[in-house]
Interface confidence: low
Amino acid sequence: EEVILLDSKASQAELGWTALPSNGWEEISGVDEHDRPIRTYQVCNVLEPNQDNWLQTGWISRGRGQRIFVELQFTLRDCSSIPGAAGTCKETFNVYYLETEADLGRGRPRLGGSRPRKIDTIAADESFTQGDLGERKMKLNTEVREIGPLSRRGFHLAFQDVGACVALVSVRVYYKQCRATVRGLATFPATAAESAFSTLVEVAGTCVAHSEGEPGSPPRMHCGADGEWLVPVGRCSCSAGFQERGDFCEACPPGFYKVSPRRPLCSPCPEHSRALENASTFCVCQDSYARSPTDPPSASCTRPPSAPRDLQYSLSRSPLVLRLRWLPPADSGGRSDVTYSLLCLRCGREGPAGACEPCGPRVAFLPRQAGLRERAATLLHLRPGARYTVRVAALNGVSGPAAAAGTTYAQVTVSTGPGAPWEEDEIRRDRVEPQSVSLSWREPIPAGAPGANDTEYEIRYYEKGQSEQTYSMVKTGAPTVTVTNLKPATRYVFQIRAASPGPSWEAQSFNPSIEVQTLGEAASGSRDQSPA
């Protein structure tokens, strides 16, 4: 586009330019080719020699222009059509400009500290004759000249007549600029064009509100000499929380989000999340839902799983092994990373479940206690004659650190026998004498396993029919005992319990009870007995 600095045709009032001498250039009202009223300057002192008539415009601010165009529309009379003017008539005039920081006023054109610079000598492509004048065939010439680059704030134009018959119909002064625009979400300011012979003017754009430059490509455009924008380079992208809408970035509406400038559009909130505000850069998980630290913002919110289903167990007593298996939770929480974790509690045989304590490091878990993907586990090294509660918790990527102790678990409570890890027929009556009995039993923990050597056994016995309170007791570290000083031909009740030494000993029960009758004095020899 053209930025007009001066247009003489636009003035309805007198132009009031400075003419020296006073009998030279003269301001005259006229009409243009469309019969619109205009102000013109004319001079026609063609019969007098040595003409030097000057016309100086008012001060013209150059604005942002450095290369300025001067468009002159004028008529010029053909000297040959003027009788008696052959020696003095000229068919050209000169145009000058004078750069200044401020208006020179109406003084002589040469004043002001710097000399006028000549733009050009202007000749007519077409001049008119007396005959044309009579027929009103004024032949309008248009000439455009470029001046600059200018450095001061403004300038005056000056026209020198040296003896022509000329009428200045229009003086138009302008510079070309590329108009302010928005391209690729970047605003580019109105930019004055350089000369047609200069390089393009590179202009950096400014990203529109809520946008930012693309990686490595700050937005740029080039203003061409004709005032047209050329060669866009790079663009802006709407910031996180905003998306492109024509030439601007609009906030993501509630329910939508945009996490990065690299994503072009807002996305609907993933499942189980919401964005209540405009311009959300992420969506907040709904109550009881969460994302794991490794989930991207585009991931659906998920929740911890429900408890494992159908927890079943089997207890084998030789050796003492608890096997568990279960089914996946009914609700995985929307995630595929479900794992299982086991918690083992050893509880008192009676009373509330709260009287429990962790099983401790002695109990072994196969394949492991936590992070199981399998849906089965085995517990080893359980103590005989104890009651165990085992909880199996389902966990996933959004289960908190305390989730295993939370409520999403299934549990079973198991007693490791009716008081001991032996059935009645697992205790051997190895030797029965009139005054002694030898008993043996299998070890509750396999030989060689951790904890096997720590087991102690306590044997309690009393005469059948007597009060249990009148018992006698022996201890042994091996799974065998010989009790002596018994009465012949008497029925005794024997009870065995096993435990590792320590305060938990008292919690173990004496079970089962087996009865053995010593031999009478008359009995011959000793005899081995198979398990009865």
């Epitope: 809520h210 930012e212 490595g216 490509s217 996180a240 990065s260 690299r262 991207p296």
Partner: antibody, heavy 112, light 106 residues
Amino acid sequence: QVQLQQSGAELMKPGASVKISCKATGYTFSTYWIEWVKQRPGHGLEWIGEILPGSGRTNYKEKFKDKATFTANTSSTTAYMQLSSLTSEDSAVYYCAIDWYWGQGTTLTVSS
Amino acid sequence: QIVLTQSPAIMSASPGEKVTITCSASSSVSYMYWFQQKPGTSPKLWIYSTSNLASGVPARFSGSGSGTSYSLTISRMEAEDAATYYCQQRNSYPPTFGGGTKLEIK
């Protein structure tokens, strides 16, 4: 889940070249920019540049344009950074990153 | 390129104390990102888009700021917060990091 596994430590001689790899899993490899960051003790973190694997498009920080070259193999979902004409100034830990997921870092030592 | 200046470069704080780390940009940026790095590990995104906590970051952390001035604040310092914190801008390319603030526990 997103994981970036980088190649192991390298000991190189001055003037040599080295190629560091970054194996990406857990996301759509071709559509995310992979960035490379340099960390020297006492010098903090410095962005080297980035590559968009799907198109091969790259952006380099000016000072690394003649030092680093990024490539990517979409079939193996692996990004590479080659560093050439090595000097002691190139001794550093180099990280690959995508959005806010970072690799574990590759230590490069340049010594004669 | 935009230069990010962090202050202080090193500081120590007692448990329970309030901590503020600042990051000043040489030109205006839209958002600031903060990373935490502990010795021998990769940087971890800590705060993104100026004020949003990354997943798993304790609520005692917060971020704020606009234009050329940003900050990371810990309302009550804990031992696990001892680390080096870096700010990063991605508004203008190339992305740049601050020089880091080493936060120690007294």
